[in-house]
């Protein structure tokens, strides 16, 4: 079945050294346990996190994200997942793309992370 992938339309903000969540979901909501789900960074498609065959595929990760990411899967049965990145670095700033692949059908959503210096940070909004 077909679906859309939805991510944050507003930039996600994080402080250096903190953790940040990048949420992503499919619509209409459906069980994504059997799908391939991942995040990569354009333009060179460096793998930030990959989930396939019901498991996190740590071996496919770009070295700079090894040990810093966690896929929150408690709502994957509804097609909702979140990538948590720990110990945020300035180099994490920029674009991320989340994708869901169901057999040969794949959709994705782009999102943006803004990283700020904690000594010069003003709460957004």
């Amino acid at each position: 079945g077909q679906f859309r992938v939805i991510g944050p339309r507003h930039p996600i903000r994080a402080l250096v050294g903190d953790e940040v969540e990048l949420p992503c979901r499919i619509s209409p909501g459906k069980n994504a346990t059997g799908m391939e789900v991942g995040w990569y960074r354009p333009p060179f498609s460096r793998v930030v996190h990959l989930y396939r065959n019901g498991k996190d595929q740590d071996g496919d990760q770009a070295p700079e994200y090894r040990g810093r990411t966690e896929l929150l899967k408690d709502a994957i049965g509804e097609g909702k997942v979140t990538l948590r990145i720990r110990n945020v670095r300035f180099s994490d700033e920029g674009g991320f793309t989340c994708f869901f692949r169901d057999h040969s059908y794949q959709e994705e959503a782009a999102m943006e992370l803004k990283v700020e210096d904690p000594f010069y940070w003003v709460s957004p909004g």
Epitope: R4, I6, G7, P8, R9, H10, I12, R13, A14, L15, D18, E19, V20, E21, L22, P23, C24, R25, S27, P28, L72, D74, A75, K80, T82, R84, S123, P124, G125
Partner: antibody, heavy 119, light 107 residues
């Protein structure tokens, strides 16, 4: 099952302060964004504030910016709303509600707690 | 900020009627729109998300449509328990604004 229970409402004088709490259970609290929504007597719904799962991002309606502070304690599965410099127009039922990462509608709501600002 | 304008603000209908409520956004919000039902003294209940997807457990007589700026909630055959106030909400961007509500009462 998912449950959200608000507390801390009551009668307060204009200019006063109040802290609302929302105790969450039945889900992985730290993995969800949380919101406060209010409803003045006989009026419609007004979104007030939101906070990300980690607490690192917060958002406010213009009507409360600089006066209200949203926070959360993930170790206690509790959401808070610190309300300062209260005005008569802040009188409302305050609901907490969860959403998924700020990219979903509010699928679970608490029962609400009434805040009355009056002298 | 994105404003949502619902119409009508109230309507009277009979059991079995087809009821349509519209919600117009001041700027495009893709499909990031939800519809809620609220009864007096109760918290709102999610009916429709992503403009047209039915929330689990909600009767199929409720449906939503639209994209961009114009959205519709339809109740195909009004039931006694459907007399309530209905709100649209956008979650495209903060602040996550609500429409002013549409009260559906008995004719």
């Amino acid at each position: 099952q998912v449950q959200l229970v608000e507390s801390g409402g009551g009668l307060v004088q204009p200019g006063g302060s109040l802290r609302l709490s929302c105790a969450a259970s039945g889900f992985a609290f730290r993995n969800y964004a949380m919101n406060w929504v209010r409803q003045a007597p006989g009026k419609g719904l007004e979104w007030v504030s939101a906070i990300s799962g980690s607490g690192g991002s917060t958002y406010y309606a213009d009507s409360v910016k600089g006066r209200f502070t949203i926070s959360r304690d993930n170790s206690k599965n509790t959401l808070y709303l610190q309300m300062n410099s209260l005005r008569a127009e802040d009188t409302a039922v305050y609901y907490c509600a969860r959403d998924y990462g700020g990219i979903s509608p509010f699928d679970y709501w608490g029962q609400g707690t009434l805040v009355t600002v009056s002298s | 900020d994105i404003q949502l304008t619902q119409s009508p603000s109230s309507l009277s209908a009979s059991v079995g009627d087809r009821v349509t409520i519209t919600c117009r956004a001041s700027q495009g919000i893709s499909s990031a729109l939800a519809w809620y039902q609220q009864k007096p003294g109760k918290a709102p209940k999610l009916l429709i998300y992503d403009a047209s997807s039915l929330e689990s457990g909600v009767p199929s007589r409720f449906s939503g449509s639209g994209s961009g700026t114009d959205f519709t909630l339809t109740i195909s055959s009004l039931q006694p328990e459907d007399f309530a106030t209905y709100y649209c909400q956008q979650f495209n961007s903060y602040p996550h604004t609500f429409g002013q509500g549409t009260k559906v009462d008995i004719k």
